[in-house]
Interface confidence: low
Amino acid sequence: SERCDDWGLDTMRQIQVFEDEPARIKCPLFEHFLKFNYSTAHSAGLTLIWYWTRQDRDLEEPINFRLPENRISKEKDVLWFRPTLLNDTGNYTCMLRNTTYCSKVAFPLEVVQKDSCFNSPMKLPVHKLYIEYGIQRITCPNVDGYFPSSVKPTITWYMGCYKIQNFNNVIPEGMNLSFLIALISNNGNYTCVVTYPENGRTFHLTRTLTVKVVGSPKNAVPPVIHSPNDHVVYEKEPGEELLIPCTVYFSFLMDSRNEVWWTIDGKKPDDITIDVTINESISHSRTEDETRTQILSIKKVTSEDLKRSYVCHARSAKGEVAKAAKVKQKVPAPRYTVELACGFGAT
């Protein structure tokens, strides 16, 4: 067989679909690999061929498009399952070719089972809602192209296992689910079940997403440095270990990069010769506000080190702040025992 541009197995597009539901899968060649679309390819005389490798097999097989009720079919650059079966799981290849040109890509398709409460191994998209922010909506995802606009499907929304009806602050509105005022108690998995008729049959599409209620931009503030602060002095003798925590609170901000770093005498620790280590830990509140702690550690501090300037810096999309730690050398205590002994001797 002649050479073919083989893009290999595109594991970035791990496609998961539910058993016993329709699935429409576009050939990834036109979306991610080639600079032209299916219509252009088709009008240029190129043919799109599909085949697959079953799970735990090496043999590439043609796809059977002659199953009862056209269970598997191809329409333009889309492979259709009406509906899927568990043993449709495997690696699917779409190949575009004519006598002089060939390009192909494979992708994994996993048909997964769900239980009666929509629990499954499906990786769920996460939709973030701002806490107490006014009306916000989520939309039933990935249902475009399954039925024409003339078909009016029925849509049922669930939170976990339970049909959403008479909920205090969550209202189903067709393909949308409206949250009147999002609260922490709204965290959870939400499922829309879209039911539509086609050629005398009824099909269901199940789509689950995770709602996470996060801090509102109305409440967002620049980073707050809790430590170091003016109340704590790091007083050490040479030879002791110096530990200074830099603890910074960051409000949740969508797509913000939160950064914390130390400078010693105005330089990054990597750029100086002191034997310094920095350990970072991160914790999150229920609304995904973030607290980052970076502990600066010098195992055996010298008197020179105790004269340096140690500054904690923090930055987010809301701004940049810095705070110096108060570091000083401990003054040796007077030797009272000797002085007192002398005093007693004098009486």
């Epitope: 089972q113 769900k114 239980d115 009666s116 409460c117 629990n119 029925t154 049922t156 669930y158 939170m159 976990g160 296992c161 339970y162 049909k163 008479n166 909920f167 108690s185 959870g188 079940v193």
Partner: antibody
């Protein structure tokens, strides 16, 4: 653990509230269901309160039975319009999760007798 | 309303034998089915959920199968302690009805 209380002899029409007290169970993470069993008969599902506080009941129980979270450790079953046919042992049970439907930890039950 | 029908109502088998109990749902409930064991004077004990998943601590002599409307509970290598009444329960919820309905029960006598 799960423990039911409040079962007693009542006359027809008397309202009655049963209480389910849990220990070692976070009601924010588990749904709680009520099931009853008439003497010598099978199990009959009454309803469930989900972890987020919503009540779902079997169609036959609509209007007469209400489940609510009374506190962080108690779930109440309020019953009205009782008739002798409601005589049964009433069980409270923990759902396997927030809303799986299956019940994995049961109390010993409390007996309600409706008689004139 | 959804109806769960259990058969047989009663069955008798010797120690070491195998008992098969069937449960039929009046509508498709996927794998939304649980099985319970109840001994006299005691509350029910969850054996199987999700039609075939063994609850923790349940011996592997118990097994469940089925999907949709037809379900089976099999108890093999019967022991005298398996004498009890067994119930199936629908745990499936859909837009038209809430799950929870129990089957009528099957009394298992071990001889």
């Amino acid at each position: 653990s799960v423990e039911e209380s409040g079962g007693r002899l009542v006359t027809p029409g008397t309202p009655l509230t049963l209480t389910c007290t849990v220990s070692g169970i976070d009601l924010d993470n588990y749904a709680m269901g009520w099931v009853r069993q008439a003497p010598g008969k099978g199990l009959e599902y009454i309803g469930v309160i989900s972890s987020d506080g919503f009540f779902y009941d079997a169609s036959w129980a609509k209007g007469r039975f209400t489940i609510s979270k009374a506190s962080s450790t108690t779930v109440d079953l309020k019953m009205t319009g009782l008739t002798p046919e409601d005589t049964a042992t009433y069980f409270c049970a923990r759902d396997r999760g927030t809303s799986t439907g299956s019940l994995d930890l049961w109390g010993q039950g409390t007996l309600v007798t409706v008689s004139s | 309303a959804l109806v769960m029908t259990q058969t047989p109502a009663s069955v008798s088998e010797p120690v070491g034998g195998t008992v098969t109990i069937k449960c039929q749902a009046s509508e498709n409930i996927g794998n939304g089915l649980a099985w319970y064991q109840q001994k006299p004077g005691q509350p029910p004990n969850l054996l199987i959920y999700g039609a075939s998943t063994l609850a923790s601590g349940v011996p592997s002599r118990f097994s469940g199968s089925g999907y949709g409307t037809e379900f089976t509970l099999t108890v093999s290598d019967l022991e005298s302690g398996d004498a009890a009444t067994y119930y199936c329960q629908c745990t499936y919820w859909n837009p038209d009805y809430i799950g929870g309905a129990f089957g009528g029960g099957t009394e298992v006598v071990v001889t």
